[in-house]
Amino acid sequence: DAEFRHDSGYEVHHQKLVFFAEDVGSNKGAIIGLMVGGVV
């Protein structure tokens, strides 16, 4: 017998979280950036 469909035709790959911080001028504050990638 043929198999019934049981996947949605796409995959979710491991997500990569990349953090970075930069000094901002004289106030020494930090900007935190978050990038989420890898979802096809």
Epitope: D1, E3, F4, H6, S8, V12
Partner: antibody, heavy 124, light 112 residues
Framework: QVTLKESGPGILKPSQTLSLTCSFS??????????VGWIRQPSGKGLEWLAH???????YYNPSLKSQLTISKDTSRNQVFLKITSVDTADTATYYC????????????????WGQGTTLTVSS | DVLMTQTPLSLPVSLGDQASISCRSS???????????LEWYLQKPGQSPKLLIY???NRFSGVPDRFSGSGSGTDFTLKISRVEAEDLGVYYC?????????FGAGTKLELK
């Protein structure tokens, strides 16, 4: 909330074509992973799966009836249709539509919502 | 086709009893993705079927914990630990791994 409701002619004569409509709300067939199937049940008997259609128009049929069956959808109207050609008295049954979705993210791979059913009598 | 054989076809019980329903498939219903799509549905008179158990042993949302499913390969069981009046009806096992999708003939749970 999710609801499904079947509608049909009620009575047909042998050799006629059955046209069924499943009107639903609370979900959309434009959503990836979503699907709707048809199941029937002769009075006092068991359940028989007929066909299933997915959001991407992929279709599955019961091979024993495939030559008679056509499943289709109108995504914008939230409706799924089933046609059965050349009906016979053996097609007398209650016809149900039910939602079954597939997703890699959530475990929804089952018939979680069913309509109330529409009854067909085939009689000459 | 995958034939789903349920036993017994009729199960008379008293309220508070434990009930056990067996379902055997004519071939393995393990899908190529590793999952076993074995489900149990309850149909009460005049109503549409309602999902109880999916993937052999997972209780659907809102299903009381007196219902439990077990098994593997071709041999599956539904157990009700203490039957209540609202549990009476016809229980169907179902396989969703192979086309055509198929149901068992049903087991009628009724009062003695």
């Amino acid at each position: 909330q999710v609801t499904l409701k079947e509608s049909g002619p009620g009575i047909l004569k042998p050799s006629q074509t059955l046209s069924l409509t499943c009107s639903f709300s609370g979900f959309s067939l434009s959503t990836s992973g979503m699907g709707v199937g048809w199941i029937r049940q002769p009075s006092g008997k068991g359940l028989e799966w007929l066909a299933h259609i997915w959001w991407d128009d992929d279709k599955y049929y019961n091979p024993s009836l495939k030559s008679q069956l056509t499943i289709s959808k109108d995504t914008s109207r939230n409706q799924v249709f089933l046609k059965i050609t050349s009906v016979d008295t053996a097609d007398t049954a209650t016809y149900y539509c039910a939602r079954r979705s597939i997703s890699t993210l959530v475990p929804e791979d089952y018939f979680d919502y069913w309509g109330q059913g529409t009854t067909l009598t085939v009689s000459s | 086709d995958v034939l789903m054989t349920q036993t017994p076809l009729s199960l008379p019980v008293s309220l508070g009893d434990q009930a056990s329903i067996s379902c055997r498939s004519s071939q393995s219903i393990v899908h190529s993705n590793g999952n076993t799509y074995l489900e149990w549905y309850l149909q009460k008179p005049g109503q549409s079927p309602k999902l109880l158990i999916y993937k052999v042993s997972n209780r659907f949302s809102g299903v009381p914990d007196r219902f439990s499913g077990s098994g593997s390969g071709t041999d599956f069981t539904l157990k009700i630990s203490r039957v209540e009046a609202e549990d009476l009806g016809v229980y169907y096992c179902f396989q969703g791994s192979h086309v055509p999708l198929t149901f068992g003939a049903g087991t009628k749970l009724e009062l003695k």
